[in-house]
């Protein structure tokens, strides 16, 4: 009989095992295990009839197509077999074991245990046929196996083989090299290439194989296997394998399609092509004069293009436009884009303007073109070239005049300071009295007035001040504080000032020239309580011509000490000889109050200990700080007055011979002005130098050397 | 003629906010200041504060400066006066004064729950 | 802030006599820059809004009449009425113009 076993181990004895088994029997053991297994058969205890060849009593091992053993015997003979230590593995997962036994046993045979179990196939290790095996990588599990690829390979649905994903392959350069994939490594399995080549219109492709060309091939079919297809629009070529690469193909097209198969067999190193577009042919180009073209070749295709470039000094003039380069192309149908351009000396045009300057020509007939030269100059005595520049420049290759310091950037032609056109008389020991100023003389002296039509009625006063460049003027900060306030400081509002500057005489202000602010600037810690700190500027509107009736006073060096004791300066002003009177009445015409004429005085720098003492004895809360120094005589007569407020206490500067502000009309009193012990208190203006540089927006090194050569 | 004329008296209960028009016209409304000063029932004048219409710039009485906010309205001409958290001691007439020269004719803010 | 202290509150005046009212101010109000007293006087009439006589202390603003003058320099000052009209009853107030500005407590003019 047959028994049917289907675990995965199991015990086989021969019938009445232990006790000896019965003639005439015969019984089969069908084992079968699930795939991926064998089974291992072994006998633990094995005793049957002894015959030739197991004619007898035998154990018979098979599959379903091959005997695996036969058994019989007690201990192995020439003739017969016994299992001993053997070990019996199917190839599958089935195994037939039959037992039989004849008819008569002389003795008393005990028969036999045997032993089964499932045990995992190595399909990684035991699969030769290619057919069946993995492409790549192959990974055992008890029960079965599975296959993977190498990275930038796809399992293929058959799941052994490798396949790449090269479908989507497109060439748009001039040339190029495409190769079958991992080439010249065997080309990967079960794979559709596809690489398209498209260049622009007007290109045609043409094909070279290179190197090693082998695509699995056929004896008698051609190429069934493995193969290359070339597709130029509706045409095909091939397809082409085997180890002889096919001839250079001129396709005559600007779009290609090259297919690759492979199937799913077969170890070939594939192929590599390389292409190049060709085109047509341009005529020969000359390069202009003073010029050339870039790249220089013998031949020019369509596509090629030239850099037309010009020699130093020269511009490419295309149709009636400069240019620093132009570029030409060849085009599909054998033409130029353009004709060649002309190559023209660099003009640099009429040089830009100089404020306050001139110009000159150095090349004849007032060249303006590469490599001439022009000189800038400076409208003297009021303006001077800052830095001592030389003022020359060339016409430079890239069509600017150009300087060797300072590039393409203008010179600056700063106003001269403190140098009157007429000469101030010479100082003397003793004071003379005030006196009518001749027309420049105080060049730098300013009327400020100042008319807040804010308010009804209006308010109206008017101060004195210093230009210090053509921009800006230099006063005192009680001339331009809004008057309305009572602790607070407030400038006044810009559309209420006016600056009258070159005037001589208050009564004709028509050779004046007046200008109104741009700007009002506070010093931030002006104190209306003790006038520290009275100084501003005011920017004009507009820069104003210098000339011999208006021209800057000088600033004097960064000094703490401000003027030395007993220095005679020099102040001007319009302001008043009575202090009773009205602003309203000294503006209007006609007034005797206002000095119609700029008046000046000498007056002396009275040291601080004793300016100082003669203030403390007053009733009153005055002080006299350090940013004020203070002038005038013990025994009065001469002094400043309300409406010269802001004026500029002028000091001749021995090293740099100009005059120099040190100081600005601040206050007095209480008593009249000009009173006996009673000094004027000014501004000390060099404790401020580098505060009003950086409200002029100049470093203090532009201006500073004029004062200090 | 030049001449500032007000807006229309007003009822506002505590705590509300009040706000006054005050149009000018006849002379430069930019360049002069406008100043408001207010006048209790049967008080005197107090001054409240001012503003330049042209620049935006203001002063304020010290009293008022957390609850009164003045602005103008170039384009017509126009200044305001905004008075916040409003109390009983707030009814007056309130003036608009041209720097001090030409006053509008008032406006009545009567201030009850 | 600067305080106006005025008087007398209240004045009584036969018609065609001299009226005279006082300001006097916690401070100087002559500004030495523009040689003025910032200080002006208004009349307010019943009903009315108050109207400018006199500013700078002592300059009459145009169609006031001259029977109004004012006077002083500093921190005293003095608006007179010469003769007084019957269109005169009014309260007339002080302000200074510092800012914050500030008035007067006013004094109140009546026919005796």
């Known amino acids: 009989h047959t028994v049917e076993l289907n675990n995965m181990f199991g015990q086989i004895q021969s019938p009445g095992y232990p006790d000896s088994y019965p003639s005439d029997s015969e019984v089969t053991w069908n084992i079968t295990v699930p795939d991926g297994f064998r089974i291992k058969l072994y006998f633990m205890h094995f005793n049957l009839e002894s015959s030739y060849l197991c004619e007898y009593d035998y154990v018979k091992v098979e599959t379903e197509d091959q005997v695996l053993a036969t058994f019989c015997g007690r201990e192995t003979t020439d003739t017969e077999q016994t299992p001993g230590q053997e070990v019996v593995l199917s190839p599958g997962s089935f195994m037939s074991i039959t037992f039989r036994s004849d008819f008569s046993n002389e003795e008393r045979f005990t028969g036999f245990d045997a032993h089964y179990m499932a045990v995992d196939v190595d399909e990684c290790k035991e699969r030769e046929d290619e057919e069946l095996s993995c492409d790549h990588y192959c990974h055992n599990y008890i029960g079965g196996y599975y296959c993977s690829c190498r990275f930038g390979y796809i399992l293929h649905t058959d799941n052994r083989t490798c396949r790449v994903e090269c479908s989507d392959n497109l060439f748009t350069q001039r040339t190029g090299v495409i190769t079958s994939p991992d080439f010249p490594n065997p080309y990967p399995k079960s794979s559709e290439c596809l690489y398209t080549i498209e260049l622009e219109e007007g290109f045609m492709v043409n094909l070279q194989f290179e190197d090693i060309f082998d695509i699995e091939d056929h004896p008698e079919v051609p190429c069934p296997y493995d193969y290359i297809k070339i597709k130029v629009g509706p045409k095909v070529l091939g397809p082409f394998c085997g180890e002889k690469a096919p001839e250079p193909i001129s396709t005559q097209s600007h779009s290609v399609l090259i297919l690759f198969h492979s199937d799913n067999s077969g170890e070939n190193r594939g192929w590599r092509l390389s292409y190049r577009a060709a085109g047509n042919e341009c005529p020969e180009l000359q390069p202009p004069v003073h010029g050339k073209i870039e790249p220089s070749q013998a031949k020019y295709f369509f596509k090629d293009q030239v850099l037309v470039s010009c020699d130093t000094g020269y511009k490419v003039l295309k149709d009636n436009v400069e240019m620093d380069t132009f570029q030409i192309e060849c085009l599909k149908d054998g033409t130029w884009s353009n004709k060649i351009p002309t190559c023209k000396i660099v003009d640099c045009r009429a040089p830009g303007e100089l404020e306050h300057g001139l110009i000159t020509f150095s090349t004849r007939n007032n060249l303006t073109t590469y490599k001439s030269e022009i000189k800038y100059s400076c409208q003297e005595p009021y303006y001077k070239m800052l830095n001592n520049n030389t003022g020359i420049y060339t016409c430079s290759a890239q069509g600017v005049w150009m300087n060797k310091v300072l590039g393409r950037s203008l010179p600056t032609c700063l106003p001269e300071c403190g140098q009157p056109s007429r000469s101030l008389p010479s100082l003397v020991k003793r004071i003379i009295g005030g006196r009518n100023a001749e027309p420049g003389l105080f060049p730098w002296q300013a009327l400020i007035v100042v008319e807040d039509t804010s308010r009804v009625p209006n308010d109206k006063w008017f101060g004195s001040g210093a230009l210090l460049s053509a921009s800006w003027i230099l006063t005192a900060a009680h001339v331009l504080r809004s008057q309305r306030r009572d602790t607070t400081v407030i400038p006044v509002s810009k559309e209420h000032v006016t600056v009258y500057l070159g005037l001589h005489d208050v009564r004709d202000k028509s050779g004046a020239v007046n200008s109104s602010a741009a700007r009002v600037v506070l010093h931030p810690d002006f104190n209306i309580q003790n006038y520290n700190h009275d100084i501003a500027l005011v920017q004009l509107q507009e820069p104003v011509p210098l000339g011999p009736h208006v021209m800057p006073v000088c600033l004097p060096r960064l000094e703490p000490e401000g003027p030395a004791p007993h220095m005679l300066g020099l102040v001007a002003g319009w302001g008043i000889s009575n202090p009773n009177v009205t602003v309203d009445e000294i503006i209007s015409s006609g007034t005797r109050t206002l000095s119609d004429v700029l008046q000046y005085v000498k007056l002396p720098v009275v040291p601080h200990a004793e300016c100082k003492t003669s203030y403390e004895s007053r009733s009153g809360n005055y002080s006299v700080t350090e940013n004020m120094f203070c002038a005038g005589y013990y025994e009065g007569g001469k002094d400043t007055c309300l409406g010269d407020s802001g004026g500029a206490f002028v000091i001749f500067d021995d090293l740099s011979q100009r005059w120099v502000v040190q100081g600005l009309v601040s206050w007095g009193g209480p008593e009249e002005c000009g009173s006996k012990q009673v000094y004027g208190v000014y501004t000390k203006v060099s404790n401020y130098v580098d505060w009003v540089w950086e409200q002029m927006g100049l470093p203090q090194s532009v201006v500073e050397p004029q004062v200090e050569r | 003629q030049v001449q500032l004329v007000q807006s229309g008296a007003e009822v506002k209960k505590p705590g509300a906010s009040v706000k006054v028009s005050c149009k000018a016209s006849g002379y430069t409304f930019t360049g002069k200041w406008i100043e408001w000063v207010r006048q209790a029932p049967g008080q005197g004048l107090e001054w409240m504060g001012e503003?330049?219409?042209?620049?935006?710039?203001?002063d304020y009485n010290e009293r008022f400066k957390d609850r009164a906010t003045f602005t103008a309205d170039t384009s017509t001409s126009t200044a305001y006066m905004e008075l916040s958290s409003l109390r009983s001691e707030d009814t007056a007439v309130y003036y608009c004064?041209?720097?001090?020269?030409?006053w509008g004719q008032g406006t009545l803010v009567t201030v009850s729950s | 802030d600067i305080v106006l202290t005025q008087s007398p509150d209240s004045l009584a005046v036969s018609l065609g006599e001299r009226a005279t009212i006082n300001c006097k101010s916690s401070q100087n109000l002559f500004n030495s820059r523009t040689r003025k007293n910032y200080l002006a006087w208004f009349q307010q009439k019943p009903g009315q809004s108050p109207k400018l006589l006199i500013y700078w202390a002592s300059t009459r603003e145009s169609g006031v009449p001259d029977r109004f003058s004012g006077s002083g320099s500093g921190t005293d000052f003095t608006l007179t009425i010469s003769s007084l009209q019957a269109e005169d009853v009014a309260v007339y107030y002080c302000k200074q113009s510092y800012i914050p500005f500030t008035f007067g407590g006013g004094t109140k003019v009546e026919i005796k």
């Open positions: 004064v041209r720097s001090e020269d030409l």
């Open positions: 503003i330049l219409p042209g620049s935006g710039s203001t």
